[in-house]
């Protein structure tokens, strides 16, 4: 025979073709072998001009031989070489699919590989590629878009060889709250790390507000609206500054009375105050908390105390906010001016968390009267709020 060629090569099959001998022959003897593969020999009819090679090893160079037989006579042997394709990984699956994450898993191909090429694409045409190592059989996808169809494909690599791609299709789950109106909704969306988040007042995407979320204290989901920790920020500010907010939300800051009014107008909120001083801690929780609008001069409502710090906020309940340039307290003197801060002063305060940091003079410092009195300025203080029904929402999410 002559003109031995191979065609239709895959990772496990190939088709051998040849030109028949000029003389009539009884049979052809075909043999093929590869590195680490024992030789296989097959005899086929003398009028056959092709033979399907099966059960081949992937990514293997084979040597194929053929000769003709007629009675006791044998023709000379002709030879061809071919290399099977790299076989594909198997069983690509997307599991643990969340709103922004998914886990891809697969089984490795039979052939040894030098790595894998992962490609994932969303319906909007966003394509991302990543190459992972040869021993990897799973990969966590992150920063996905919620409620989005994705096609994930994987291809094995071995030097210049590339397998066929296999694919799987999955859809990320929708966010419970696409535009979270507070940190509790951000948390129910699956965000469990404390830090900066964007919330949307009344769930309106045009009303974005960057806030610091405390996702750890008492179950998390708190919008922090005041932090004192080192005295670097000046809290002896005017009415306009307290209305708008000031400071660095990762450090010392005040979120702003306008923001507090808008947030607490969204529903029933609770207040938590966390205090720390020289290794001691205390907290106060009020199950009803709201701040009125500018017309009420941001009137405070705070009721339903529990905690370890003592009920110092009750004294301030029903009071309007006061600053040195807008005196709304019930004292003859200006409380904000007298005590170098700002608060929902009455005459004057049991709480002065916006007082002078580190000032232990009577009533001048960061005070929470029923914990450390008026002659000790507290080192660390945070005020934060979340929906009063957060526990119910959290339980519902866990059941879901």
């Amino acid at each position: 025979p002559s003109g031995l060629v191979t065609a239709n090569i895959t990772d496990s099959e190939a088709l051998a073709r040849w030109q028949p001998a000029i003389a009539t022959v009884d049979s052809y003897v075909i043999s093929y072998t590869g590195e680490k593969v024992p030789e296989i020999t097959r005899t086929v009819s003398g009028n056959t001009v092709e033979y399907a090679l099966t059960d081949l090893e992937p990514a293997t160079e084979y040597t194929l031989r053929i000769f003709a037989e007629k009675g006791p006579q044998k023709s000379s042997t002709i030879t061809a070489k071919f290399t099977t394709d790299l076989d594909s990984p198997r069983d690509l699956t997307a599991t643990e699919v969340q709103s922004e994450t998914a886990l891809l898993t697969w089984r490795p191909p039979r052939a040894s590989v030098t790595g894998y090429l992962l490609v994932y694409e969303s319906v909007d045409g966003t394509v991302k590629e990543v190459i992972v190592g040869p021993d990897t059989t799973s990969y966590s996808l992150a920063d996905l878009s919620p409620s989005t169809h994705y096609t994930a494909k994987i291809q094995a690599l071995n030097g210049p060889l590339r397998s066929n791609m296999i694919q799987t299709i999955f859809t990320t789950i929708g966010l419970l709250y696409p535009f979270p109106k507070d940190c509790s909704q951000a948390m129910l969306n699956g965000d469990t790390t404390s830090g900066l988040y964007t919330i949307y007042l009344n769930g309106d995407k045009a009303e974005a507000l960057e806030v610091f979320c405390d996702m750890t204290s008492d179950g998390g989901g708190w919008i922090v609206f005041l932090r004192r920790k080192n005295g670097r920020e000046n809290f002896y500010q005017n009415w306009k500054a307290y209305a708008a907010g000031f400071g660095d939300r990762r450090e010392e800051f005040w979120l702003g009375l306008d923001n507090l009014n808008k947030i607490t107008a969204q529903g029933q909120y609770e207040l938590r105050v966390d205090l720390r001083d020289h290794g001691e801690t205390a907290f106060a929780v009020y199950d009803k908390f709201s701040v009125g609008d500018a017309k009420t001069r941001y009137k405070l409502k705070v009721e339903g105390y529990s905690g370890t710090a003592g009920d110092s906020m009750a004294y301030h309940n029903g009071r309007s906010f006061s600053t040195f340039d807008k005196d709304t307290d019930s004292a003859i003197t200006n409380c904000a001016l007298s005590y170098k801060g700002a608060f929902w002063y009455r005459n004057c305060h049991r709480v002065n968390l916006m007082g002078r940091y580190g000032d232990n003079n009577h009533s001048q410092g960061v005070n929470w009267f029923h914990w450390k009195g008026h002659e000790h300025s507290i080192q660390f203080a945070e005020m934060k709020l979340r929906p009063s029904n957060f526990r119910n929402l959290e339980g519902r999410r866990k059941r879901a």
């Epitope: 009721e303 105390y305 529990s306 009920d311 009750a314 004294y315 309940n317 029903g318 019930s330 004292a331 003859i332 009455r346 005459n347 004057c348 305060h349 049991r350 009577h362 009533s363 008026h374």
Partner: antibody, heavy 120, light 107 residues
Framework: QVQLVESGGGLVQPGRSLRLSCAAS????????MHWVRQAPGKGLEWVSG????????YYADSVKGRFTISRDNAKNSLYLQMNSLRAEDTALYYC?????????????WGQGTMVTVSS | DIQMTQSPSSLSASVGDRVTITCRAS??????LNWYQQKPGKAPKLLIY???NLETGVPSRFSGSGSGTDFTLTISSLQPEDFATYYC?????????FGQGTKVDIK
């Protein structure tokens, strides 16, 4: 209208017990801390005891600590003062009083008082 | 405990007189000071809270001032119904304490 009415006073021998009650009406009782204040005959006012709106926190003057117990039943809008081991110096007119807002605050509503006389 | 000292302990005045009663706290109490009026056989009545705020229904001839440790109750023009005993009270901390009282009688 807002009203406090005390009852339970009377003549009692030293060492014995007495329980005073105060019935409240006209306001949301459990929103407010309540106090007992006493006035010995011909003398000034002396704060005796106080209790938070929920009943979770209680406070006593040193002179009655360990002998008197303040309590409240918010379902019944009632305040109580259990007085044990009574002494002659406990003889006084006992008033219950409502605070304006917080535990330590002005007393804006007072009852008419109930007289306790400790004598053998 | 915070001691409250009132002066004078008694005073005689005529209708129309301006009367001033002072109250001193043994320690700094911001403006946590209240004034009460008590007539014989009656319960005390709140007049002034937070040192200077007039309780609802109290005539405007009564006024309060002061902060820190020194406080004053002033009756601008004494009326017949004002003859009574007046008490100051600190609500700064527990135990809340009262002054010993100032008796205002007719001259």
């Amino acid at each position: 209208q807002v009203q406090l009415v005390e009852s339970g006073g009377g003549l009692v021998q030293p060492g014995r017990s007495l329980r005073l009650s105060c019935a409240a009406s006209g306001f949301t009782f459990d929103d407010y801390a309540m106090h007992w204040v006493r006035q010995a005959p011909g003398k000034g006012l002396e704060w005796v005891s106080g209790i938070s709106g929920s009943g979770g926190s209680t406070y006593y003057a040193d002179s009655v600590k360990g002998r008197f117990t303040i309590s409240r039943d918010n379902a019944k809008n009632s305040l109580y003062l259990q007085m044990n081991s009574l002494r002659a110096e406990d003889t006084a007119l006992y008033y219950c009083a409502k605070v304006m807002s917080s535990m330590e605050d002005a007393f804006d509503i007072w009852g008419q008082g109930t007289m306790v006389t400790v004598s053998s | 405990d915070i001691q409250m000292t009132q002066s004078p302990s008694s005073l005689s005045a005529s209708v129309g007189d301006r009367v001033t009663i002072t109250c001193r706290a043994s320690q700094y109490i911001q403006g946590f000071l209240n004034w009460y009026q008590q007539k014989p056989g009656k319960a005390p009545k709140l007049l002034i809270y937070d040192a200077s705020n007039l309780e609802t229904g109290v005539p405007s001839r009564f006024s309060g001032s002061g902060s820190g440790t020194d406080f004053t109750l002033t009756i601008s023009s004494l009326q017949p119904e004002d003859f009574a005993t007046y008490y100051c009270q600190q609500s700064y901390s527990t135990p809340q304490t009262f002054g010993q009282g100032t008796k205002v009688d007719i001259k």
